[in-house]
């Protein structure tokens, strides 16, 4: 083993902050991978690792791409996977992960399943079905076109399966209440039998959730098929199309036919022979757990090992089981000893404004070969084995609750983008005037303009739009905004005035006096919904119960914010709910809180800060 210039932490209760996330894995899996990676070192040395929610953490964990704010840019897919800094203050000790990698558990993309008989267990790739190997979800054995997968290595033996994310199960956002697509559907007089991007300028695939969009105007966005999104080839980012024809034969899953290197590929149209559009199927990805355990070794003070079997050896290789070699253990115990673990003492969540740390960069831990850019070369022409005749029976077809809405057509009732001063890029905005979830989309208001953020991959940002075009009565500067989840009325606050919009109809401005708020309340920082037509209204460190119907506060209900929401800044300038969490903004940062959505119920176990992040990077997903 080697240590890094003798650098190590001067305390044994190490704290870490997961500053942002990759979209390759569910957040709870990422949290778990990092916790397990720390535990590897905690098992052999007297160290404890406590997750905190702010930049005061010893080890700040970040996903980034290319130039990500330090002097060590990433390099795209493969090559450098991550990097870490030696122990110390500021950026020292931090670990950065290259989000151009495919992060997995080391065995391919992680696809959650729905219904079936596996309780939502992820797909197992590859899996065997009727003697054939599958590395992506398949429609084989089904006549309704719904993709499915086995959740164990052998469906034939175990019979465990689930359905993969698919527009045939559900849609996301839109106004179709999460219902599945109806195929075929009519849009602008034309029939569509698959999701389409027609009528949209942002590339999102959508469908109608009734047979006729022109008539019903109901639609949703089609779920991303991560298992079938190709890389390389000549169609990167497109979806595999199954079945597809290659050399006259039909393929229902990725194949290595026609290639000497054995790599799996697919066509991205239904006929490779005529269209020649193709890409490589997703690979096994890199185990976030293993790479993190390696990086955390660096962050604790270990340099690379010359022992090929050691976790700290500089090349990535996937392995199962406990990853540490004797050389790794000797190294960490040389630095921190082998005594018993100290008592963990979780630090209190900061309530002062966090200072941003320089974004970390990562260096690679492996040098795999780059993807070739040539198409599949003609090879064996043997037909794939016939598809199965039996299939897993479908489960229920209920759908998740709807999310943000946006019309499938490019045009909308909102103003088209016009020049914005000072800057039309929301990623350049230090502090937004107000943020609110309206019609399922997160709205970011600044100086009389706003952007809409739809939470899916790709380019989810729309705008800027002129606020006064959409809500003509409003002033340029807002303090907060809030949509009543029941009535869909939108409340806007600026200074001591309130406006309430029901569709295009406005009531107001009304003085805060009318709400029962005295002259000492100079502005409203935000509202959080409660059940039964109630909300919490915030201003300057205080919170009132607010009746959304009568539009009055209960003057007896006023309490200090920290009595109900511990750990959030008392002087949050914007407070809103998004995806069933409360967000408290101060400066460039937000504090996210899981809270009990019940009137008159305050549960201090629930109203806890569970994340702190940047408004721009983490909510707006700025680069």
């Amino acid at each position: 083993f080697q240590t890094f210039k003798g650098l190590k932490w001067d305390h044994h209760n190490i704290t870490y902050w997961i500053q942002n996330y990759s979209e390759d894995l569910p957040r709870d899996m990422i949290d778990d991978a990092f916790a397990r990676a720390f535990a590897v070192w905690g098992e052999v040395a007297p160290l404890t690792f406590t997750r905190v929610y702010g930049p005061e953490a010893d080890i700040v964990i970040q996903f980034g791409v290319a130039e990500h704010g330090d002097g060590y840019p990433f390099d795209g897919k493969d090559g450098l996977l991550a990097h870490a800094f030696p122990p110390g203050a500021g950026v020292q000790g931090d670990a950065h992960f290259d989000d151009d990698e495919l992060w997995s558990l080391g065995k391919g993309v992680v696809i959650p399943t729905y219904y079936g008989n596996s309780n939502g267990a992820p797909c197992h790739f590859p899996f065997t079905f009727e003697g054939r190997s599958y590395s992506a979800c398949t429609t084989d054995g089904r006549n309704d076109g719904t993709p499915w997968c086995s959740t164990t290595a052998d469906y034939d033996k175990d019979g465990k399966f689930g359905f993969c994310p698919s527009e045939r199960l559900y849609t996301e956002h839109g106004n179709g209440e999460g219902k599945p697509c109806v195929f075929p559907f009519i849009f602008e007089g034309r029939s569509y039998s698959a999701c389409t991007t027609k009528g949209r300028s942002d590339g999102y695939r959508w469908c109608a959730t009734t047979a006729n969009y022109d008539q019903d105007k109901l639609y949703g966005f089609c779920p991303t098929r991560v298992d079938a999104t190709v890389v390389g080839g000549n169609s990167a980012g497109e979806l595999c199309v199954f079945p597809f024809v290659f050399l006259g034969k039909q393929y229902s899953s990725c194949t290595s036919d026609g290639r000497r290197d054995g790599r799996l590929w697919c066509a991205t149209t239904s006929n490779f022979d005529t269209d020649k559009k193709w890409g490589f199927c997703p690979d096994q990805g890199y185990s976030l757990f293993l790479v993190a355990a390696h990086e955390f070794g660096h962050a604790l003070g270990l340099d690379h090992s010359s022992v090929p079997e050691a976790l700290m050896y500089p090349l990535y290789s996937y392995l199962e089981g406990f990853p540490l070699n004797k050389d790794d253990i000797d190294g960490i115990q040389y630095l921190y000893g082998r005594g018993s673990k100290p008592d963990p003492r979780p630090p209190a969540t900061t309530t002062t404004e966090p200072q941003p740390t320089a974004p970390p960069t990562m260096c690679p831990t492996i040098p795999p070969t780059a993807y070739p850019t040539v198409g599949p070369t003609v090879g064996p022409t043997g037909a794939p084995s016939p598809g199965p005749t039996s299939s897993p029976s479908p489960g229920p077809t209920g759908a998740p609750s709807p999310g943000p809405t946006a019309p499938p057509t490019a045009g909308s009732s909102e103003a088209s983008t016009e020049s914005l001063s000072p800057a039309d890029n929301p990623c350049n905005v230090d502090v937004f005037d107000a943020i609110a979830e309206i019609q399922g989309a997160l709205h970011f208001f600044k100086d009389g303009w706003y952007w809409k953020f739809l939470n899916h991959r790709g380019s989810p940002l729309q705008g800027p739009f002129l606020t006064a075009r959409t809500w003509p009565a409003l002033p340029a500067t807002l303090d907060s905004a809030f949509e009543d989840p029941q009535t869909k009325r939108v409340f806007f606050f600026s200074g001591r005035q309130m406006w309430v919009y029901t569709g295009k109809t406005v009531l107001g401005p009304r003085s805060l006096d009318k709400l029962g708020l005295g002259p000492e309340v100079t502005h409203v920082s935000g509202l959080l919904p409660r059940r039964l037509g109630k909300a919490l209204l915030f201003s300057k460190g205080r919170v009132w119960r607010f009746d959304l119907k009568s539009q009055k506060v209960d003057p007896q209900s006023v309490i200090r914010v920290d009595k109900e929401f511990s750990g959030v800044p008392w002087n949050s300038h914007d407070i809103f709910q998004y995806q069933d969490k409360a967000y408290f903004c101060h400066g460039k940062f937000f504090w996210r809180v899981s809270f009990q959505n019940e009137v008159n119920k305050v549960d201090h176990e629930v109203n806890q800060v569970d994340d702190v992040g940047y408004v721009t990077y983490d909510l707006l997903q700025c680069p």
Epitope: Y72, D75, K77, P86, H304, P314, P364
Partner: antibody, heavy 124, light 107 residues
Framework: EVQLLESGGGLVQPGGSLRLSCAAS???????DMWWVRQAPGKGLEWVS?????????YYADSVKGRFTISRDNSKNTLYLQMNSLRAEDTAVYYC?????????????????WGQGTLVTVSS | EIVLTQSPATLSLSPGERATLSCRAS??????LAWYQQKPGQAPRLLIY???YRATGIPARFSGSGSGTDFTLTISSLEPEDFAVYYC?????????FGQGTRLEIK
């Protein structure tokens, strides 16, 4: 012993092209970032470009972006700089340099070995 | 990009004296700073990496200190061969940048 030997410099007219080479020996070339740094006559040092070990990532100074291309051949332990659309302000001694850093442990900052340099003169 | 300002531009000292060269960054770069020595007609030579660590083969009279924005290269007792131009270089943020140099000349 670590050695870096540049070649390929010379006199070229504005708008012309040159290809610089840097032959490396004495270390495992394929695992290090490699850099080109230049120095105009009587001036300070200016970074030009960097290439990562596999050649999969390259970065350029704004002043040369779109005109210069860095590449490497790990089987030949050689670094290259293809310079097109040359301008008078590109006149300089061009050095190749080896990064002290290796892999994913950030902190070994500095270029620990440099070539002797090759002079590129752009003039009509 | 981060600007590195070296001072003084020229330093005139005699052999045996102590030399103190300064490098100031326009924003914090933690300890990601290196110092180089360059003699006429030669390539630069790495003296100090990560603000305070001497590179292989560098005599003990050379030392580096500082963190954040202010850094110092100290030569405790000047030898005749130390008279040269000295450059600092940062990698605390992208892109890397060099200082304009300090010329150390014989008084």
């Amino acid at each position: 012993e670590v050695q870096l030997l540049e070649s390929g410099g010379g006199l070229v007219q504005p708008g012309g092209s040159l290809r610089l080479s840097c032959a490396a020996s004495g270390f495992t070339f394929s695992v290090y970032d490699m850099w080109w740094v230049r120095q105009a006559p009587g001036k300070g040092l200016e970074w030009v470009s960097v290439i990562y070990p596999s050649g999969g990532a390259t970065y350029y100074a704004d002043s040369v972006k779109g005109r210069f291309t860095i590449s490497r051949d790990n089987s030949k332990n050689t670094l290259y700089l293809q310079m097109n659309s040359l301008r008078a302000e590109d006149t300089a001694v061009y050095y190749c340099a080896k990064d002290r850093a290796y892999g994913d442990y950030v902190g070994w900052n500095g270029f620990d070995y440099w070539g002797q340099g090759t002079l590129v003169t752009v003039s009509s | 990009e981060i600007v590195l300002t070296q001072s003084p531009a020229t330093l005139s000292l005699s052999p045996g004296e102590r030399a103190t060269l300064s490098c100031r960054a326009s924003q914090s770069i933690s300890s990601f700073l290196a110092w180089y020595q360059q003699k006429p007609g030669q390539a630069p030579r790495l003296l100090i990496y990560d603000a305070s660590y001497r590179a292989t083969g560098i005599p003990a009279r050379f030392s580096g200190s500082g963190s954040g924005t202010d850094f110092t290269l100290t030569i405790s007792s000047l030898e005749p061969e130390d008279f040269a131009v000295y450059y600092c270089q940062q990698r605390g943020n992208w892109p890397i940048t060099f200082g304009q140099g300090t010329r150390l000349e014989i008084k």
